[in-house]
Interface confidence: low
Protein backbone atom coordinates (compact mmCIF):
# COMPACT_ATOMS: atom_id res chain seq x y z
CA UNK A 1 0.00 0.00 0.00
CA UNK A 2 1.34 3.54 -0.91
CA UNK A 3 0.58 5.80 1.15
CA UNK A 4 1.02 9.31 -0.62
CA UNK A 5 0.07 13.10 -0.37
CA UNK A 6 1.08 14.13 -3.91
CA UNK A 7 1.64 17.58 -4.71
CA UNK A 8 0.06 19.42 -7.78
CA UNK A 9 3.59 19.29 -9.86
CA UNK A 10 4.03 15.63 -9.13
CA UNK A 11 1.44 15.31 -11.96
CA UNK A 12 3.40 16.72 -15.01
CA UNK A 13 0.69 15.95 -17.81
CA UNK A 14 -1.56 18.67 -15.73
CA UNK A 15 1.35 21.24 -14.50
CA UNK A 16 0.68 24.47 -14.71
CA UNK A 17 3.92 26.47 -15.64
CA UNK A 18 3.84 29.49 -13.48
CA UNK A 19 0.53 29.93 -14.36
CA UNK A 20 -1.60 30.04 -10.99
CA UNK A 21 -4.61 32.13 -10.66
CA UNK A 22 -4.75 34.80 -8.27
CA UNK A 23 -7.44 34.69 -5.09
CA UNK A 24 -8.16 37.86 -3.82
CA UNK A 25 -10.35 38.00 -0.58
CA UNK A 26 -11.48 40.15 2.04
CA UNK A 27 -9.18 39.54 5.37
CA UNK A 28 -12.43 39.95 7.83
CA UNK A 29 -15.47 39.42 7.64
CA UNK A 30 -18.23 40.03 11.24
CA UNK A 31 -21.53 37.62 10.54
CA UNK A 32 -23.82 39.70 13.11
CA UNK A 33 -26.76 37.62 11.75
CA UNK A 34 -25.00 34.13 11.58
CA UNK A 35 -24.74 34.82 7.77
CA UNK A 36 -22.54 36.05 6.02
CA UNK A 37 -21.21 37.08 1.83
CA UNK A 38 -17.67 36.24 1.40
CA UNK A 39 -16.64 36.79 -2.62
CA UNK A 40 -13.68 35.29 -3.94
CA UNK A 41 -11.82 37.58 -6.67
CA UNK A 42 -9.93 35.92 -9.78
CA UNK A 43 -7.42 36.76 -12.07
CA UNK A 44 -9.51 34.78 -14.13
CA UNK A 45 -12.26 35.06 -16.44
CA UNK A 46 -14.52 31.73 -15.28
CA UNK A 47 -17.18 32.45 -18.71
CA UNK A 48 -17.99 29.51 -20.69
CA UNK A 49 -14.98 27.25 -18.22
CA UNK A 50 -15.81 23.66 -16.64
CA UNK A 51 -14.59 24.83 -13.39
CA UNK A 52 -14.50 23.66 -9.43
CA UNK A 53 -14.44 26.89 -6.69
CA UNK A 54 -15.04 26.04 -3.20
CA UNK A 55 -14.32 26.93 0.30
CA UNK A 56 -12.47 25.57 2.65
CA UNK A 57 -12.19 26.43 6.30
CA UNK A 58 -9.63 26.43 8.56
CA UNK A 59 -5.54 26.74 8.54
CA UNK A 60 -5.24 23.65 7.11
CA UNK A 61 -8.02 23.55 4.83
CA UNK A 62 -9.55 20.58 6.29
CA UNK A 63 -13.29 21.52 5.86
CA UNK A 64 -14.54 21.63 2.54
CA UNK A 65 -17.52 24.13 3.22
CA UNK A 66 -19.56 24.70 -0.05
CA UNK A 67 -18.37 24.25 -3.29
CA UNK A 68 -19.24 25.74 -6.74
CA UNK A 69 -19.52 23.97 -9.90
CA UNK A 70 -19.51 25.41 -13.51
CA UNK A 71 -20.09 23.61 -16.27
CA UNK A 72 -20.37 25.41 -20.04
CA UNK A 73 -23.64 23.26 -20.75
CA UNK A 74 -24.80 22.46 -17.48
CA UNK A 75 -26.38 24.88 -14.75
CA UNK A 76 -24.60 25.86 -11.89
CA UNK A 77 -24.50 22.98 -9.15
CA UNK A 78 -24.20 24.52 -5.30
CA UNK A 79 -23.60 22.69 -2.14
CA UNK A 80 -22.45 21.62 0.83
CA UNK A 81 -20.90 18.00 1.54
CA UNK A 82 -20.13 19.32 5.13
CA UNK A 83 -23.78 20.46 6.40
CA UNK A 84 -23.73 24.14 6.06
CA UNK A 85 -26.02 26.11 4.37
CA UNK A 86 -25.18 28.03 1.30
CA UNK A 87 -25.59 29.35 -1.76
CA UNK A 88 -23.52 30.57 -4.70
CA UNK A 89 -23.54 33.39 -7.64
CA UNK A 90 -21.41 33.28 -10.62
CA UNK A 91 -19.21 36.61 -11.73
CA UNK A 92 -17.45 36.72 -14.85
CA UNK A 93 -13.92 37.18 -12.74
CA UNK A 94 -15.61 35.88 -9.01
CA UNK A 95 -17.83 33.44 -7.15
CA UNK A 96 -19.85 35.00 -3.86
CA UNK A 97 -20.07 32.04 -1.09
CA UNK A 98 -23.52 33.17 1.04
CA UNK A 99 -23.16 31.07 4.49
CA UNK A 100 -26.25 31.20 6.40
CA UNK A 101 -27.09 29.83 10.14
CA UNK A 102 -23.49 29.85 11.20
CA UNK A 103 -22.55 28.86 14.53
CA UNK A 104 -20.32 31.13 16.87
CA UNK A 105 -18.40 28.27 17.29
CA UNK A 106 -17.45 28.49 13.19
CA UNK A 107 -15.37 31.86 13.85
CA UNK A 108 -12.66 30.49 12.04
CA UNK A 109 -10.18 31.43 8.62
CA UNK A 110 -11.92 30.92 5.00
CA UNK A 111 -9.79 29.88 1.87
CA UNK A 112 -11.20 30.20 -1.74
CA UNK A 113 -9.87 27.96 -3.98
CA UNK A 114 -10.84 27.47 -7.79
CA UNK A 115 -10.00 24.35 -10.59
CA UNK A 116 -10.27 25.34 -14.26
CA UNK A 117 -10.64 21.72 -15.26
CA UNK A 118 -12.00 22.88 -19.61
CA UNK A 119 -10.46 23.92 -21.63
CA UNK A 120 -6.49 23.10 -21.48
CA UNK A 121 -4.48 23.96 -19.76
CA UNK A 122 -6.12 23.04 -15.66
CA UNK A 123 -5.12 25.55 -13.57
CA UNK A 124 -5.77 25.79 -9.88
CA UNK A 125 -4.64 28.65 -7.50
CA UNK A 126 -1.92 29.99 -5.00
CA UNK A 127 -3.12 29.82 -2.27
CA UNK A 128 -4.38 33.10 -0.77
CA UNK A 129 -4.41 34.46 2.60
CA UNK A 130 -8.18 33.81 3.71
CA UNK A 131 -10.70 35.36 5.11
CA UNK A 132 -11.03 35.39 8.81
CA UNK A 133 -15.13 35.31 9.26
CA UNK A 134 -16.16 36.09 12.96
CA UNK A 135 -19.55 34.82 13.62
CA UNK A 136 -21.47 37.13 16.69
CA UNK A 137 -24.62 37.82 17.06
CA UNK A 138 -27.26 35.13 17.68
CA UNK A 139 -26.06 32.60 19.25
CA UNK A 140 -27.59 29.17 17.35
CA UNK A 141 -26.65 25.78 18.97
CA UNK A 142 -25.71 23.30 16.71
CA UNK A 143 -27.86 19.94 16.67
CA UNK A 144 -26.02 17.27 14.85
CA UNK A 145 -28.82 14.69 15.13
CA UNK A 146 -30.95 16.82 12.54
CA UNK A 147 -28.98 19.70 11.00
CA UNK A 148 -31.36 21.62 9.35
CA UNK A 149 -31.66 25.60 8.32
CA UNK A 150 -33.49 27.46 11.32
CA UNK A 151 -36.52 29.20 10.60
CA UNK A 152 -36.66 32.40 9.20
CA UNK A 153 -37.00 35.47 11.44
CA UNK A 154 -40.28 36.93 10.51
CA UNK A 155 -41.81 33.18 10.77
CA UNK A 156 -40.32 33.13 14.24
CA UNK A 157 -42.07 37.43 14.69
CA UNK A 158 -45.30 36.27 13.28
CA UNK A 159 -45.55 33.00 15.03
CA UNK A 160 -44.77 35.34 18.46
CA UNK A 161 -47.19 37.79 17.27
CA UNK A 162 -50.30 35.20 17.22
CA UNK A 163 -49.11 33.10 20.49
CA UNK A 164 -49.27 36.97 21.95
CA UNK A 165 -53.01 37.56 20.61
CA UNK A 166 -53.76 34.28 21.36
CA UNK A 167 -52.16 34.83 25.39
CA UNK A 168 -54.41 38.20 25.58
CA UNK A 169 -57.27 36.63 23.81
CA UNK A 170 -57.44 33.94 26.22
CA UNK A 171 -56.77 35.94 29.35
CA UNK A 172 -59.48 38.52 28.59
CA UNK A 173 -61.95 35.46 28.24
CA UNK A 174 -61.12 33.98 31.35
CA UNK A 175 -61.05 38.02 32.94
CA UNK A 176 -64.55 37.79 31.85
CA UNK A 177 -65.37 34.36 32.93
CA UNK A 178 -64.34 34.75 35.83
CA UNK A 179 -66.14 37.87 36.81
CA UNK A 180 -69.39 36.36 35.40
CA UNK A 181 -68.77 33.25 37.78
CA UNK A 182 -68.33 35.25 40.37
CA UNK A 183 -71.40 37.44 39.61
CA UNK A 184 -73.52 34.45 39.33
CA UNK A 185 -72.33 32.76 42.43
CA UNK A 186 -73.23 36.01 44.53
CA UNK A 187 -76.31 35.57 43.19
CA UNK A 188 -77.12 31.73 43.81
CA UNK A 189 -75.37 32.42 47.36
CA UNK A 190 -78.32 34.92 48.19
CA UNK A 191 -80.92 33.44 46.86
CA UNK A 192 -80.18 30.12 48.68
CA UNK A 193 -79.66 32.00 52.40
CA UNK A 194 -83.06 33.59 51.61
CA UNK A 195 -85.61 32.52 54.22
CA UNK A 196 -87.67 29.96 53.05
CA UNK A 197 -91.30 30.71 53.07
CA UNK A 198 -91.94 26.72 53.06
CA UNK A 199 -89.43 25.33 55.08
CA UNK A 200 -88.86 21.71 54.26
CA UNK A 201 -87.00 19.16 54.60
CA UNK A 202 -85.98 19.20 50.72
CA UNK A 203 -83.66 22.21 51.26
CA UNK A 204 -81.78 21.13 54.09
CA UNK A 205 -78.84 19.64 51.83
CA UNK A 206 -77.95 23.02 50.98
CA UNK A 207 -77.03 24.63 54.24
CA UNK A 208 -73.89 23.20 55.15
CA UNK A 209 -73.00 24.99 51.68
CA UNK A 210 -74.23 28.20 52.83
CA UNK A 211 -71.90 30.50 54.12
CA UNK A 212 -73.77 32.20 57.73
CA UNK A 213 -75.22 35.65 57.03
CA UNK A 214 -76.05 38.53 59.32
CA UNK A 215 -79.41 39.89 57.98
CA UNK A 216 -79.71 42.15 60.60
CA UNK A 217 -77.26 44.42 58.63
CA UNK A 218 -79.76 44.31 55.29
CA UNK A 219 -81.92 46.46 57.81
CA UNK A 220 -82.73 49.72 56.90
CA UNK B 1 -6.69 0.21 7.43
CA UNK B 2 -7.33 1.98 3.79
CA UNK B 3 -6.80 -0.58 1.27
CA UNK B 4 -7.57 -0.17 -2.41
CA UNK B 5 -7.47 -3.04 -5.10
CA UNK B 6 -7.38 -2.17 -8.53
CA UNK B 7 -8.13 -5.03 -11.05
CA UNK B 8 -9.61 -5.67 -14.50
CA UNK B 9 -6.11 -4.86 -16.22
CA UNK B 10 -4.31 -6.78 -19.38
CA UNK B 11 -3.29 -6.98 -22.82
CA UNK B 12 -5.84 -5.01 -25.47
CA UNK B 13 -5.61 -4.43 -28.71
CA UNK B 14 -5.63 -0.43 -30.38
CA UNK B 15 -9.46 0.16 -30.22
CA UNK B 16 -10.59 -1.78 -27.65
CA UNK B 17 -12.13 -1.76 -24.56
CA UNK B 18 -11.26 -2.55 -20.62
CA UNK B 19 -12.83 -2.46 -17.52
CA UNK B 20 -11.35 -1.48 -14.53
CA UNK B 21 -12.19 -1.87 -10.79
CA UNK B 22 -10.96 -1.03 -7.39
CA UNK B 23 -12.30 -2.44 -4.34
CA UNK B 24 -12.09 -0.31 -1.47
CA UNK B 25 -12.17 -1.16 2.32
CA UNK B 26 -11.12 0.35 5.71
CA UNK B 27 -12.69 3.91 5.59
CA UNK B 28 -16.51 5.46 4.45
CA UNK B 29 -16.44 4.84 0.79
CA UNK B 30 -19.21 6.73 -0.17
CA UNK B 31 -18.28 9.88 1.53
CA UNK B 32 -14.82 10.31 0.08
CA UNK B 33 -13.61 11.34 -3.53
CA UNK B 34 -12.18 8.80 -5.72
CA UNK B 35 -9.26 9.27 -8.92
CA UNK B 36 -7.92 7.19 -11.00
CA UNK B 37 -3.94 8.05 -12.43
CA UNK B 38 -1.58 6.08 -14.37
CA UNK B 39 1.85 5.64 -14.56
CA UNK B 40 3.80 5.03 -18.25
CA UNK B 41 6.64 3.26 -18.29
CA UNK B 42 9.58 5.64 -17.63
CA UNK B 43 7.11 8.47 -17.18
CA UNK B 44 5.70 10.32 -14.42
CA UNK B 45 2.44 10.12 -12.30
CA UNK B 46 -0.53 10.88 -14.56
CA UNK B 47 -4.21 11.89 -13.27
CA UNK B 48 -6.97 10.40 -15.33
CA UNK B 49 -10.22 11.00 -13.70
CA UNK B 50 -11.95 11.98 -10.94
CA UNK B 51 -15.66 11.61 -9.28
CA UNK B 52 -17.03 13.01 -6.29
CA UNK B 53 -18.57 11.05 -3.26
CA UNK B 54 -22.07 11.35 -4.21
CA UNK B 55 -21.12 10.27 -8.02
CA UNK B 56 -22.69 13.10 -9.90
CA UNK B 57 -19.71 14.82 -10.52
CA UNK B 58 -16.90 13.84 -12.87
CA UNK B 59 -13.57 15.10 -14.62
CA UNK B 60 -11.61 13.50 -16.97
CA UNK B 61 -8.09 14.41 -18.12
CA UNK B 62 -7.71 16.16 -21.32
CA UNK B 63 -6.00 13.06 -22.68
CA UNK B 64 -9.11 10.76 -21.92
CA UNK B 65 -11.67 13.00 -22.35
CA UNK B 66 -15.02 11.04 -24.12
CA UNK B 67 -13.29 7.92 -24.23
CA UNK B 68 -12.73 7.36 -20.68
CA UNK B 69 -15.69 6.87 -17.63
CA UNK B 70 -15.33 6.90 -14.37
CA UNK B 71 -18.25 5.63 -11.93
CA UNK B 72 -18.60 3.95 -8.78
CA UNK B 73 -21.08 1.62 -7.15
CA UNK B 74 -20.91 3.07 -3.24
CA UNK B 75 -23.34 0.00 -2.20
CA UNK B 76 -20.03 -2.30 -3.28
CA UNK B 77 -17.44 0.10 -2.39
CA UNK B 78 -16.32 -0.15 -5.91
CA UNK B 79 -15.19 2.48 -8.26
CA UNK B 80 -14.52 1.63 -12.00
CA UNK B 81 -13.08 2.58 -14.90
CA UNK B 82 -14.34 2.36 -18.45
CA UNK B 83 -11.76 2.25 -21.28
CA UNK B 84 -12.98 2.77 -24.64
CA UNK B 85 -11.03 3.45 -28.35
CA UNK B 86 -7.73 2.60 -26.32
CA UNK B 87 -4.40 3.50 -27.51
CA UNK B 88 -0.93 2.50 -27.69
CA UNK B 89 -0.06 5.78 -25.43
CA UNK B 90 -3.07 4.49 -22.72
CA UNK B 91 0.01 1.62 -21.82
CA UNK B 92 0.55 2.15 -17.98
CA UNK B 93 0.19 1.18 -14.51
CA UNK B 94 -3.15 2.37 -13.39
CA UNK B 95 -3.96 3.53 -10.09
CA UNK B 96 -7.08 3.93 -7.79
CA UNK B 97 -6.40 6.51 -5.19
CA UNK B 98 -8.78 8.63 -2.82
CA UNK B 99 -8.27 12.28 -3.26
CA UNK B 100 -9.76 14.42 0.13
CA UNK B 101 -10.28 17.28 -1.66
CA UNK B 102 -10.82 18.54 -5.58
CA UNK B 103 -9.50 16.55 -8.32
CA UNK B 104 -6.39 18.28 -8.99
CA UNK B 105 -5.36 18.63 -4.88
CA UNK B 106 -3.58 14.90 -4.76
CA UNK B 107 -4.33 11.59 -3.17
CA UNK B 108 -3.54 10.26 0.20
CA UNK B 109 -4.33 6.94 -0.56
CA UNK B 110 -3.34 4.93 -3.82
CA UNK B 111 -3.63 1.04 -4.31
CA UNK B 112 -0.63 -1.01 -6.16
CA UNK B 113 -2.38 -0.28 -9.31
CA UNK B 114 -2.94 -2.82 -12.34
CA UNK B 115 -1.16 -3.02 -15.82
CA UNK B 116 -3.09 -2.12 -18.98
CA UNK B 117 -1.26 -2.74 -21.91
CA UNK B 118 -2.39 -1.81 -24.89
CA UNK B 119 -0.61 -3.12 -28.52
CA UNK B 120 -1.20 -4.55 -31.69
Known amino acids: MLRLLLALNLFPSIQVTGNKILVKQSPMLVAYDNAVNLSCKYSYNLFSREFRASLHKGLDSAVEVCVVYGNYSQQLQVYSKTGFNCDGKLGNESVTFYLQNLYVNQTDIYFCKIEVMYPPPYLDNEKSNGTIIHVKGKHLCPSPLFPGPSKPFWVLVVVGGVLACYSLLVTVAFIIFWVRSKRSRLLHSDYMNMTPRRPGPTRKHYQPYAPPRDFAAYRS | EVQLLESGGGLVQPGGSLRLSCAAS????????MSWARQAPGKGLEWVSWIEAPGVQTFYADSVRGRFTISRDNSKNTLYLQMNSLRAEDTAVYYC?????????????MGQGTLVTVSS
Open chain 2, 26 to 33: GFTFDSAN
Open chain 2, 97 to 109: ARSPFGPLYGFDY
